[in-house]
């Protein structure tokens, strides 16, 4: 059958040991009684842990009460409250108890303080500037048209920012892709090849379809 120490009858952190007849509690400092239920501790002893506020207990005969801060419980605020046991995060979100606050780390495709918003729905999602919404892997994303970027394709991206056209060539941000207009004397998709005075180019081997001054296709 169940032993007398099952369920730990000793309060206030006392340790239970079985005796031939029953059990015996070995009480921590400041506690006494059969089950260590009587406190000899006062607020002067600072019995409240984890920032708990002690009230009462000015003399050995009067009890004290610990008012615990959020996230802690127990007569001495010694126990951390497991707020994640209530499973507050929805849609498979990971619960993180930071003590001062609760955080939900949401799975891809979900958002909100409790992961309550389902983002994996292209029907209700607008991608700006000609972008298209793509679903997959439990998430969604906007596939942006050329020249745009960001979460909703609202940010302008300049394909010419990296200065891809060599030898002073001009880069234009055309909707079909970047375009190089080469300075006189150069040719190639990126204006990388000089054109010799006789009209021949310095191409190691002329790529098919590449003419002097050809733009990027």
């Amino acid at each position: 059958g169940p032993g007398p120490c099952d369920g730990n009858p000793c309060a206030n952190g006392g340790s239970c040991s079985e005796t031939p007849r029953s059990f015996e509690c070995t009480c921590p400092r400041g506690f006494y009684g059969l089950r260590c239920e009587v406190s000899g501790v006062t607020c002067a002893d600072g019995p409240c842990f984890n920032g708990g506020l002690c009230v009462g207990g000015a003399d050995p005969d009067s009890a004290y009460i610990c008012h615990c801060p959020p996230g802690f419980q127990g007569s001495n605020c010694e126990k951390r409250v497991d707020r994640c046991s209530l499973q507050p995060c929805r849609n498979g979100g990971l619960c993180l108890d930071l003590g001062h606050a609760l955080r939900c780390r949401c799975r891809a495709g979900f958002a909100g303080p409790r992961c309550e918003h389902d983002l994996d729905d292209c029907a209700g999602r607008a991608c700006a500037n000609g972008g298209t919404c793509v679903e997959g892997g439990g998430a969604h994303r906007c596939s942006c048209a050329l020249g745009f970027g960001g979460r909703d394709c609202r940010e302008r991206a300049d394909p010419c920012a990296a200065r891809p056209c060599a030898h002073g060539g001009r880069c234009y941000a055309h909707f079909s892709g970047l375009v190089c207009a080469c300075a006189p004397g150069y040719m190639g998709a990126r204006c990388e090849f000089p054109v010799h005075p006789d009209g021949a180019s310095a191409l190691p081997a002329a790529p098919p379809g590449l003419r002097p001054g050809d733009p990027q296709r």
Epitope: R156, R170, Y172, A173, F175, L178, V179, A181, C182, P215
Partner: antibody, heavy 118, light 109 residues
């Protein structure tokens, strides 16, 4: 919506000066374009005047426009055209236009009329 | 750089075909950086074709561009009343130079 709007046109006397402004909305000159000025005299075809390349600020002019016309970038959304020693023959609608690649003007403003007359 | 357009004016019946040619005194950049515009009174030019043969977004497929180097053609197949306008070719040349043709007036009857 990307738009261009010209302003600053009006009546000016021969040998006078005028500055036209092109204001962009829906985009800025942080991307690389040729922002250009094109004019069209009454009953005539369009005539290219000048461009400023927003990538590095370099400018290009029609041979006839060098010296009297100056194109510059005033801000990330405005380009200006300064015109001096204006003649009656400069009477035209002045358009601001953007080359977005392949050397064509895909975006135009509605134009501003400049009349040179005494 | 001079662009010469022929003929002007040109007349066509509704449903007919209109052909406009544009000749350049020198080759355009990349041999195909030539565009075509349509202009109606009181409006700026509107691009129809870029890079000699590419149809601009939103332009009806009855407009077709062809050619390379110095010789280019705009063809309107199945002309509509709304196509009555003046058409211009425009080239881009090495050295970052632009030029427009003189224009071709199209009358649709």
């Amino acid at each position: 919506q990307e738009q261009l709007v010209e302003s600053g046109g009006g009546l000016v006397q021969p040998e006078g000066s005028l500055t036209l402004t092109c204001t962009a909305s829906g985009f800025s000159f942080s991307s690389s374009y040729d922002m250009c000025w094109v004019r069209q005299a009454p009953g005539k075809g369009p005539e290219w005047i000048a461009c400023i390349y927003t990538g590095d600020g370099s400018t290009d002019y029609a041979s006839w426009a060098k010296g009297r016309f100056t194109v510059s970038k005033a801000s990330s959304t405005t380009v200006t055209l300064q015109m001096t020693s204006l003649a009656v023959a400069d009477t035209a609608t002045y358009f601001c236009a953007r080359n977005s690649g392949y050397g064509y003007f895909g975006l135009w403003g509605p134009g501003t009329l400049v009349t040179v007359s005494s | 750089q001079v662009l010469t357009q022929t003929p002007s004016p040109v007349s066509a019946a509704v449903g007919g075909t209109v052909t406009i040619s544009c000749q350049s005194t020198e080759s355009v950049y990349g041999s195909d950086w030539l565009s075509w515009y349509q202009q109606k009174p009181g409006q700026p030019p509107k691009v129809l074709i870029y890079q000699a043969s590419n149809l601009e977004i939103g332009v009806p497929s009855r407009f077709k561009g062809s050619g390379s180097g110095t010789q280019f053609t705009l063809t309107i197949s199945g002309a509509q009343c709304d196509d009555a306008a003046t058409y211009y070719c425009q080239g881009y040349y090495s050295g970052y130079i632009y030029a427009f043709g003189g224009g071709t007036e199209v009358v649709v009857k």
